[in-house]
Interface confidence: low
């Protein structure tokens, strides 16, 4: 559950985040699971720990393995696992499936291809983009921050897109590449002001203290592929990542589904070991797209245990 797959290429930088998150003030210790050997924090090492991040600068095939991170606070320890695989560079152009990040879709009106994992790195624009190993050229392609924007998308634009950037660590530069597939949707779609299907507005969800609870934020945005549509959770008006409660986590990545032809997104909020203070929080499901933003609020209430003796 608290394990994450990460992969990279030899001689490139790879940065991995601990799957268990905590406040910035918490200390995070990293270990190589096979030997239980502590990962050093000194930056002179090729592989070193830096808080929630584990850095391979650069990575080597021999670094492959499972790494344990332990988030330590004054009151608890949380353990996570990073399953790291470093591959040899391919001599030919084909990018194997195991090196591919999630597929994204576009349509003729708009398209954005996000460079995967880039937020973990210290990079500067512009990114370099390649399609099927060829550098992209022409006015239809725009490297915009961490995105590639393709104007007037055609079916021939489908393919594997690789972003390449430089990670800088204390003046030293390391190359990073990441590849994902891009598909082109032909359908005529439309987008609407977000419609939140769940939770209901001002919903009260019953939970049991000490148990785990899940809240799902689900919204529909129109028909066909939607651009710049998102659902997310806030706690007391604060982003989950800023709130700093490691027990409450937003599921990474949004699930896209098509319900009755409508494009919908859902985001699960997982609350581990529900506590009394969780009942005092306001949970907001936010749905936003180019048309606007909509919120539904949920509060938690204690589920009364069933009296089996009556």
């Amino acid at each position: 559950k608290f394990s994450k797959q990460s992969w990279g290429l030899e001689n490139e930088a790879l940065i991995v985040r601990c799957p268990r998150q905590g406040k910035p003030s918490y200390t995070v210790d990293w270990y190589y699971s096979q030997t239980n050997k502590s990962i050093p924090t000194q930056e002179r090492n090729r592989v070193f720990a830096s808080g929630q991040l584990l850095k391979f600068l650069p990575a080597a095939v021999a670094d492959s393995g499972i790494y344990t991170c332990i988030v330590r606070s004054p009151t608890f320890n949380r353990t996570g696992y990073a399953n790291v695989t470093i591959y040899k560079k391919q001599s030919d152009c084909n990018v194997p499936d195991y090196l591919m990040y999630s597929t994204v879709s576009g349509s003729e009106k708009n398209s954005k291809i996000y460079c995967p994992t880039i937020d973990l790195y210290n990079w500067t624009a512009p990114l370099e983009w390649f399609k099927n190993c060829q550098a992209l050229q022409g006015s239809r392609y725009r490297a915009h921050k961490s995105f590639l924007v393709i104007d007037n998308v055609m079916t021939e634009d489908a393919g594997d897109y690789t972003c390449k950037f430089i990670h800088n660590e204390n003046g030293a530069n390391y190359s990073v590449t990441a590849t994902r597939s891009f598909t082109v949707k032909d359908e005529q779609g439309f987008s609407l002001f977000p419609v939140i299907g769940a939770p209901a507005q001002n919903e009260i969800k019953e939970v049991e203290i000490g148990k785990n609870a899940n809240l799902t934020c689900s919204a529909c945005f129109g028909k066909g592929t939607q651009f710049l549509a998102a659902v997310l959770w806030q706690l007391n008006g604060t982003k989950i990542t800023d709130f700093g409660e490691p027990r409450i986590q937003q599921e990474e990545g949004q699930n896209q589904s098509f319900s009755n032809g409508l494009a919908c997104l859902d985001m699960v909020l997982r609350i581990a070991d529900v506590k009394e203070e969780d009942l005092l929080l306001q949970y907001d499901c936010l749905a936003l797209n180019l048309h606007g933003l909509r919120r539904h609020t949920v509060r938690l209430s204690r589920k009364n245990p069933i009296d089996h003796h009556s």
Epitope: L228, N236, G237, K239, D242, L290, G292, L293, R294, R295
Partner: antibody, heavy 119, light 107 residues
Framework: EVQLLESGGGVVQPGRSLRLSCAAS????????MSWVRQAPGKGLEWVSS????????YYADSVKGRFTISRDNSKNTLYLQMNSLRAEDTAVYYC????????????WGQGTMVTVSS | DIQMTQSPSSLSASVGDRVTITCRAS??????LNWYQQKPGKAPKLLIY???TLQRGVPSRFSGSGSGTDFTLTISSLQPEDFATYYC?????????FGGGTKVEIK
């Protein structure tokens, strides 16, 4: 010191265009959503438009949709409002405002720039 | 669109008075309600966000309460510098909307 400074206001004839600028300083401009809010003489506040930190999201009031365009240049720490097909009812003081990082509230405001649309 | 209705539109009060301004939303906005103060010829200033959270640097005599559709801004003991116009604003959904304002004048 955190500061927003609007410029570009003035007197303009109906149907003409004007471009407002807002120079930001004292904070990491590229991390914040930014907005324009206006106030007609003797009237209340009216939200005009908002733009996300990376320009992905742009929202407009119905009264300006199709005529006004919000944009930003993070490299120059500057927010813009391109106003086309101006009408008499667009006459107002235009404020540039910063949206809070953690809450949707306008926590920093500029001093405002006056736009007068008159023939 | 969500309409925000403020009342009263104006009030007269003396220094030291307790002043209450109300704001009503046309639909539930949870606690996505902000309060601003504006003095003549000046830009608005954020007083309270999230219905009841005091913005840094704002005196504690200002307080906010409410949730859903009904909200209140209270000044516990009016000071000379508090004579101004106060606006509520919802940030629940776009388009963002303000109340019509409440002008607090010297009695």
């Amino acid at each position: 010191e955190v500061q927003l400074l609007e410029s570009g206001g003035g007197v303009v004839q109906p149907g003409r265009s004007l471009r407002l600028s807002c120079a930001a300083s004292g904070f990491t401009f590229s991390s914040y959503w930014m907005s324009w809010v206006r106030q007609a003489p003797g009237k209340g506040l009216e939200w005009v438009s908002s733009i996300s930190s990376d320009s992905s999201y742009k929202y407009y009031a119905d009264s300006v949709k199709g005529r006004f365009t919000i944009s930003r240049d993070n490299s120059k720490n500057t927010l813009y409002l391109q106003m086309n097909s101006l009408r008499a009812e667009d006459t107002a003081v235009y404020y540039c405002a910063r949206d809070g990082l953690r809450w949707d509230a306008f926590d920093i405001w500029g001093q405002g720039t006056m736009v007068t649309v008159s023939s | 669109d969500i309409q925000m209705t403020q009342s009263p539109s104006s009030l007269s009060a003396s220094v030291g008075d307790r002043v209450t301004i109300t704001c009503r939303a046309s639909q539930s906005i949870s606690s996505y309600l902000n309060w601003y103060q504006q003095k003549p010829g000046k830009a608005p200033k954020l007083l309270i966000y999230a219905a009841s959270t005091l913005q840094r640097g704002v005196p504690s005599r200002f307080s906010g309460s409410g949730s859903g559709t009904d909200f209140t801004l209270t000044i516990s003991s009016l000071q000379p510098e508090d004579f101004a116009t106060y606006y509520c604003q919802q940030s629940y959904s776009t388009p963002l909307t303000f109340g019509g304002g409440t002008k607090v004048e010297i009695k």
